[in-house]
């Protein structure tokens, strides 16, 4: 089941998926001046079985000005965006896929890829949040969001992250400790069945992830 909405947006923060659940779609978008090759895939799809997951289809772009098919070259990382106006300054360094059955890694860039990556997430997907460059976490509770099915509708849980500018008059008495994952606040809808998957990554991962996997600018 696809999630209806984008993950929540938090001022001066960005989110990143560490891995993508089977069923996730990534649009094949080309940068300006390029287009998908004729009969090329509209999207990549994370598929697999119990032991292995991978992206079906390959995105291919060709110049809008020529009718040549695109050259197959080793893709180079380039700026990406993730279903919102947050720019990806460096490619994601995925966690070991073996530890996340039923999930795909970040797909490698393709030649002449658009600067925006548009993902269509599925129920059970988890994304992690971090303050962008120039901001730091004033408060970090559970800094992730999960797409859940509630009352037949999908919704994202709310990440608890407040980012403040480094120049603002905040007081930071001590450096943040890695955040353990508590049970969280009851949601207003919890009177009925909530279905989600058993996908759980240690929340410590969110607190200790390399900054390079997150965006470094967001305005």
């Amino acid at each position: 089941e696809l999630c209806d909405d984008d993950p929540p947006e938090i001022p001066h923060a960005t989110f990143k998926a560490m891995a993508y659940k089977e069923g996730t779609m990534l649009n094949c978008e080309c940068k300006r001046g390029f287009r998908r090759i004729k009969s090329g895939s509209l999207y990549m799809l994370c598929t697999g079985n119990s032991s292995h997951s991978s992206w079906d289809n390959q995105c291919q772009c060709t110049s809008s000005a020529t009718r040549n098919t695109t050259k197959q070259v080793t893709p180079q990382p380039e700026e990406q965006k993730e279903r919102k106006t947050t720019e990806m300054q460096s490619p994601m360094q995925p966690v070991d896929q073996a530890s996340l059955p039923g999930h795909c890694r970040e797909p490698p860039p393709w030649e002449n890829e658009a600067t925006e990556r548009i993902y269509h997430f599925v129920v059970g997907q988890m994304v992690y949040y971090q303050c962008v460059q120039g901001y730091r976490a004033l408060h970090r509770g559970p800094a992730e969001s999960v797409c859940k099915m509630t009352h037949g509708k999908t919704r994202w849980t709310q990440p608890q992250l407040i980012c403040t500018g480094e120049m603002e008059t905040s007081q930071f008495p001590g450096e943040e400790k890695p955040q353990a994952s508590p049970e969280g606040r009851p949601e207003s809808e919890t009177s009925c069945l909530v279905t989600t998957t058993d996908f759980q990554i240690q929340t410590e991962m969110a607190a200790t992830m390399e900054t390079s996997i997150f965006t470094t600018e967001y305005q």
């Epitope: 929540p8 938090i10 001022p11 004033l138 407040i162 930071f172 943040e176 606040r185 305005q219």
Partner: antibody, heavy 118, light 107 residues
Framework: EVQLVQSGAEVKKPGATVKISCKVS????????MHWVQQAPGKGLEWMGV????????NYNQKFKGRVTITADTSTDTAYMELSSLRSEDTAVYYC???????????WGQGTLVTVSS | DIQMTQSPSSLSASVGDRVTITCKAS??????LSWFQQKPGKAPKTLIY???RLVDGVPSRFSGSGSGQDYTLTISSLQPEDMATYYC?????????FGQGTKLEIK
């Protein structure tokens, strides 16, 4: 059920200090930051500051010129707001409110009236 | 600090009327704007967040719109229970700042 229960009304003299408590129940205290908001009689809302209940980080509205101090006691799931050097214009209702991801104030305390009078 | 200019400061309307309240920020606040309703003697209640997203349980007659510096709260068909004071809040930057409020009365 989520509840934020504030301490009772206070009457203070100018120059004194008031400390209001906000006791939380129904959720994990350290997950959610706590804000404090002032509302003078017949006036609008003024954000005073916020504390991370997780790590004690704070951010204050400079309008209060260093007179406000927000603290949190994780052993009792209670947040506190202390306002010093009170003056008559500090007569107001003070609210605690939690910050919930996409929007800052989803749960509020019932409010505490502080009257500053000589 | 970001200034929030809310207008009108008060208005009177009839049941069934369409009512509009506006808020203008002194700079772009990236749609990080909430609308609150406050009734006398009560704590404020969030109606809208992120400029246009309705909080669960809030009647659909309430809607929000806008981007950049200019935002609007609309009540499509005014009900007697909507008599209250309404505030906008920007939460893009610290310090968070509220509009001055709009007192809505029923004719």
């Amino acid at each position: 059920e989520v509840q934020l229960v504030q301490s009772g009304a206070e009457v203070k003299k100018p120059g004194a200090t008031v400390k209001i408590s906000c006791k939380v129940s129904g959720y994990t205290f350290t997950d959610y930051a706590m804000h404090w908001v002032q509302q003078a009689p017949g006036k609008g809302l003024e954000w005073m500051g916020v504390i991370s209940t997780y790590n004690g980080n704070t951010n204050y509205n400079q309008k209060f010129k260093g007179r406000v101090t927000i603290t949190a006691d994780t052993s009792t799931d209670t947040a506190y707001m202390e306002l010093s050097s009170l003056r008559s214009e500090d007569t107001a209702v003070y609210y605690c409110a939690t910050s919930y991801g996409n929007y800052p104030f989803d749960y509020w305390g019932q409010g505490t009236l502080v009257t500053v009078s000589s | 600090d970001i200034q929030m200019t809310q207008s009108p400061s008060s208005l009177s309307a009839s049941v069934g009327d369409r009512v509009t309240i506006t808020c203008k920020a002194s700079q772009d606040i990236n749609s990080y704007l909430s609308w609150f309703q406050q009734k006398p003697g009560k704590a404020p209640k969030t109606l809208i967040y992120r400029a246009n997203r309705l909080v669960d349980g809030v009647p659909s007659r309430f809607s929000g719109s806008g981007s950049g510096q200019d935002y609007t709260l609309t009540i499509s068909s005014l009900q007697p229970e909507d008599m209250a004071t309404y505030y906008c809040l920007q939460y893009d930057e610290f310090p968070y700042t509220f509009g001055q409020g709009t007192k809505l009365e029923i004719k």
